[in-house]
Amino acid sequence: EEELQVIQPDKSVLVAAGETATLRCTATSLIPVGPIQWFRGAGPGRELIYNQKEGHFPRVTTVSDLTKRNNMDFSIRIGNITPADAGTYYCVKFRKGSPDDVEFKSGAGTELSVRAKPSAPVVSGPAARATPQHTVSFTCESHGFSPRDITLKWFKNGNELSDFQTNVDPVGESVSYSIHSTAKVVLTREDVHSQVICEVAHVTLQGDPLRGTANLSETIRVPPTLEVTQQPVRAENQVNVTCQVRKFYPQRLQLTWLENGNVSRTETASTVTENKDGTYNWMSWLLVNVSAHRDDVKLTCQVEHDGQPAVSKSHDLKVSAHPKEQGSNTAAENTGSNERNIY
């Protein structure tokens, strides 16, 4: 009768995380008697996975009925596999011994590889907003995948980006891996509606990559352009001065009118109009009674946008061009919230 052999027919087994791994093992003889044990790894630090003789192994079930007298199939199933279960598993036959059973023969081992899906990519942008023509960095992170091979791409509005750096950690063997990528993006004035997309492709995703997105509306600041104009209204001694605030983003904006350097009125942008590119326009105006002034008046429209230093545009009203009417009422009528009389 030939000596017992322990046969593990599968050199490797590949299982998706969350599924059940089947590790096959058969013996060629019923003797010597003694239990089968399964271990992960070899040597003194090996981990006991299953002991036919004793112990509680809730994740392990046997493929065949081990209580059958002539059973020589010692295959096991391990449920709810995670990347931490990866490793080489050995089916080891023990022979009876006193007081303890003695290791008799081991199978050649089966390498269990675990396919684990990457987590949904998380894209994060800079902490502070930046203006067009500036370059900003976006990061993309995904974790927990295995095997290590993975592909990451960046897109801006569907156009693939090339200026990025990617690292997969750790460099050596591990039960699972993480990817970290940083992309550089040059902002333009049209980027309010733009999106940056990080796309991760992995063998576990079966050709359906995972995507993480960041809206550039969270990153960009488009400073406004100002234009101050005047036109006469109602009577010869009244002038309507308007300040056109154009193409700004985000909406947070405060406007202050100055008369010869003195604050006349401050207001916050409320009823704005939105442009197709996502930027905003707003207009403020003053109704100026020029008859109340002996000298020229310098009107300044000063705008503080999104907490940035104020920008301004000035306009000179030529009082000499509008002769005063003697005895005229110096208290001009206030005709609206966006109108201001200069006394």
Partner: antibody, heavy 122, light 106 residues
Framework: QVQLQQWGAGLLKPSETLSLTCAVY????????WSWIRQPPGKGLEWIGE???????NFNPSLKSRVTISVDTSKNQFSLKLRSVTAADTAVYYC????????????????WGQGTTVTVSS | SSELTQPPSVSVSPGQTASITCSGD??????VYWYQQKPGQSPVLVIY???RRPAGIPERFAGSASGNTATLTISGTQAMDEADYYC?????????FGGGTKLTVL
């Protein structure tokens, strides 16, 4: 404390069928094999066969063609039928539990019934 | 089919050590069990897994197995130990008994 109690006809004529039943009291029925053994007068022990709670059986090859062992888990009982008996089948018949212990293979017969004397005579 | 061979009889004086042998092919690779049977009684398991005693069996009963031989040793034999002793093992899926040894305490 597990006890086995057995009963059945003690006197048979040649060619009849021997029928014995063994009841298990005071312990688990599943997780064990249950055996039948016989001992002819003045001779040694001879194993007949075994069954477990799910009906899996093993038999002595020399008796297999005449033996049926069955189980009734609802009553914690198992039974032996030996067909076409002859005088050579005269013996004390024992039922026994095969200890499963911590290792389900190759265990001893740790609990025995009281024995039933079966005589085959014309 | 495996066969187990025992001496038909062994005699021992009270207080002495009795040894009963059981031989069979590759017995050392199998588990051996020993049973004691007194006249008119059912057998009792006295040794399992070669050398282990069930609860309630006196320490004077000991077993060993190696090669092709298993041995039941009763040290300090008492008159109450007089009985028939059977060795048993498994051959594949079947139980095999030895022919039995009658132990006489002189």
């Amino acid at each position: 404390q597990v006890q086995l109690q057995q009963w059945g006809a003690g006197l048979l004529k040649p060619s009849e069928t021997l029928s014995l039943t063994c009841a298990v009291y005071g312990g688990s029925f599943s997780g064990y094999y249950w055996s039948w053994i016989r001992q002819p007068p003045g001779k040694g022990l001879e194993w007949i066969g075994e069954i477990n709670h799910s009906g899996s059986t093993n038999f002595n090859p020399s008796l297999k063609s005449r033996v049926t062992i069955s189980v009734d888990t609802s009553k914690n009982q198992f039974s032996l039928k030996l067909r076409s008996v002859t005088a050579a089948d005269t013996a004390v018949y024992y039922c026994s539990r095969v200890d499963s212990g911590s290792y389900p293979y190759y265990d001893g017969l740790d609990v025995w019934g009281q024995g039933t004397t079966v005589t085959v005579s014309s | 089919s495996s066969e187990l061979t025992q001496p038909p009889s062994v005699s021992v004086s009270p207080g002495q050590t009795a040894s009963i042998t059981c031989s069979g092919d590759k017995l050392g690779d199998k588990y051996v069990y020993w049973y004691q049977q007194k006249p008119g009684q059912s057998p009792v398991l006295v040794i399992y897994h070669d050398d282990r005693r069930p609860a309630g069996i006196p320490e004077r009963f000991a077993g060993s197995a190696s090669g092709n031989t298993a041995t039941l040793t009763i040290s300090g034999t008492q008159a109450m130990d007089e009985a028939d002793y059977y060795c048993q093992t498994w051959d594949s899926s079947t139980v095999v008994f030895g022919g039995g040894t009658k132990l006489t305490v002189l």
